[in-house]
Interface confidence: medium
């Protein structure tokens, strides 16, 4: 399986909400001994390997934010903890999964990584990630809504609040 990132860059005004999105592609093993985790974390730029370093998102670790199930199933974080931090992660039946961040501040700017981990027998770990950048802007140059830049081309799209 692979992970696709529809958008590589999100440019948002301060105070706005944004939903960062990834998509799980390809066949997934539905064996009884296989579990899938989908999660999010922050990383830093300028590494040899993108997403190799991990940091919490608004003080929440990847384990606080994960969705855990047996494949292309729908799920949501119902964690009060995440929602108290203005975060919610979700996934649908089509392999899409996302994290919504509410009331963005300049401190939310940075590199975000989505991750899919396949675990067999509760032990061995196979993982695939995608990366995207969030830029939160303030002042007169900030867009009125989030602007997203597709990964495959330079065309941008305006999106309204999540």
């Amino acid at each position: 399986f692979k992970v696709a990132t529809p958008y590589s860059l999100y440019v948002c005004p301060e105070g706005q909400n944004v939903t960062l999105t990834c998509r799980l592609l390809g066949p997934v093993d539905k064996g009884h001994d296989v579990t899938f985790y989908k999660t999010w974390y922050r990383s830093s730029r300028g590494e040899v390997q993108t997403c190799s370093e991990r940091r919490p998102i608004r003080n929440l670790t990847f384990q606080d934010l994960h969705l855990h199930h047996g494949g292309h199933q729908a799920a949501n974080t119902s964690h009060d903890l995440a929602q108290r931090h203005g975060l919610e992660s979700a996934s649908d039946h089509h392999g899409n999964f996302s994290i919504t961040m509410r009331n963005l501040t300049l401190l939310d700017s940075g590199l975000y990584c989505c991750l899919v981990v396949e675990i067999r027998h509760h032990h061995s770990e196979h993982r695939v990630h995608g990366a995207m950048e969030l830029q939160v802007q303030t002042g007169k140059d900030a867009p009125s809504n989030c602007v997203v830049y597709p990964s495959s081309s330079q065309e941008s799209e305006n999106i309204t609040a999540a």
Partner: antibody
Framework: QVQLVQSGAEVKKPGASVKVSCKAS????????INWVRQAPGQGLEWIAR????????YYNEKFKDRATLTVDKSTSTAYMELSSLRSEDTAVYYC??????????????WGQGTTVTVSS | NIMMTQSPATLSVSPGERATLSCKSS????????????LAWYQQKPGQSPRLLIY???TRESGVPDRFSGSGSGTEFTLTISSLQSEDFAVYYC????????FGGGTKVEIK
């Protein structure tokens, strides 16, 4: 840079307990597992247990699950391993080591300098 | 638990020569989903902590000299040091991380 710094050597009597610390720096402490591995004199490496500091959830080698207790202090980025009911065969160097896994198991990319624990009457 | 067996226990080699260390696992550490071998090698010098050399059976850790190479798949693995330098005389451990964690007993590489 990423570093794990352990507490100093300990000498304990049989039946006592020892608590070894491991202070992390240079990375997000809450997001990486900390493992404890020991090495008896002239012997190989033996995995004891691991803990995920973000949640405090710990996982133990069956051999040590009744005697080892792992804890963390997130405010000081420090992990602890306490080993109780010490016996002479627990004399060893105890290492903390970071692993890079998310939910499964992974290799150990950073090691502490080791803490020598001697159990002697 | 997966058992790891290293041989020989001691290897006597002259500086500049090649050293070949063996590690065998009691069951395969190859993961079918990604065709990766969950095996690492560490170097330990006297009085020091282990240092990661190789992971995924053949990927060198950053900063490790290219005279170190790992090979093998499934249950049989080899660490090769192509031309031994004085700083390479140490104990080497293999480590499987497919199912919990186990280490081999180590191979001591000493000066001949």
């Amino acid at each position: 840079q990423v570093q794990l710094v352990q507490s100093g050597a300990e000498v304990k009597k049989p039946g006592a307990s020892v608590k070894v610390s491991c202070k992390a720096s240079g990375y997000s402490f809450t997001d990486y597992y900390i493992n404890w591995v020991r090495q008896a004199p002239g012997q190989g490496l033996e995995w004891i247990a691991r803990i995920f500091p973000g949640s405090g959830n710990a996982y133990y080698n069956e051999k040590f699950k009744d005697r080892a207790t792992l804890t963390v202090d997130k405010s000081t980025s420090t992990a602890y391993m306490e080993l109780s009911s010490l016996r002479s065969e627990d004399t060893a160097v105890y290492y903390c080591a970071r692993d890079d896994s998310f939910y499964g198991y992974w290799y150990f990319d950073v090691w502490g300098q080791g803490t020598t624990v001697t159990v002697s009457s | 638990n997966i058992m790891m067996t290293q041989s020989p226990a001691t290897l006597s080699v002259s500086p500049g020569e090649r050293a070949t260390l063996s590690c065998k696992s009691s069951q395969s550490v190859l993961y079918s989903s990604n065709q990766k071998n969950y095996l690492a090698w560490y170097q330990q010098k006297p009085g020091q902590s282990p240092r990661l050399l190789i992971y995924w059976a053949s990927t060198r850790e950053s900063g490790v000299p290219d005279r170190f190479s790992g090979s093998g798949s499934g249950t049989e693995f080899t660490l090769t040091i192509s031309s031994l330098q004085s700083e390479d005389f140490a104990v080497y451990y293999c480590h499987q991380y497919l199912s919990s964690y186990t280490f081999g007993g180590g191979t001591k590489v000493e000066i001949k």
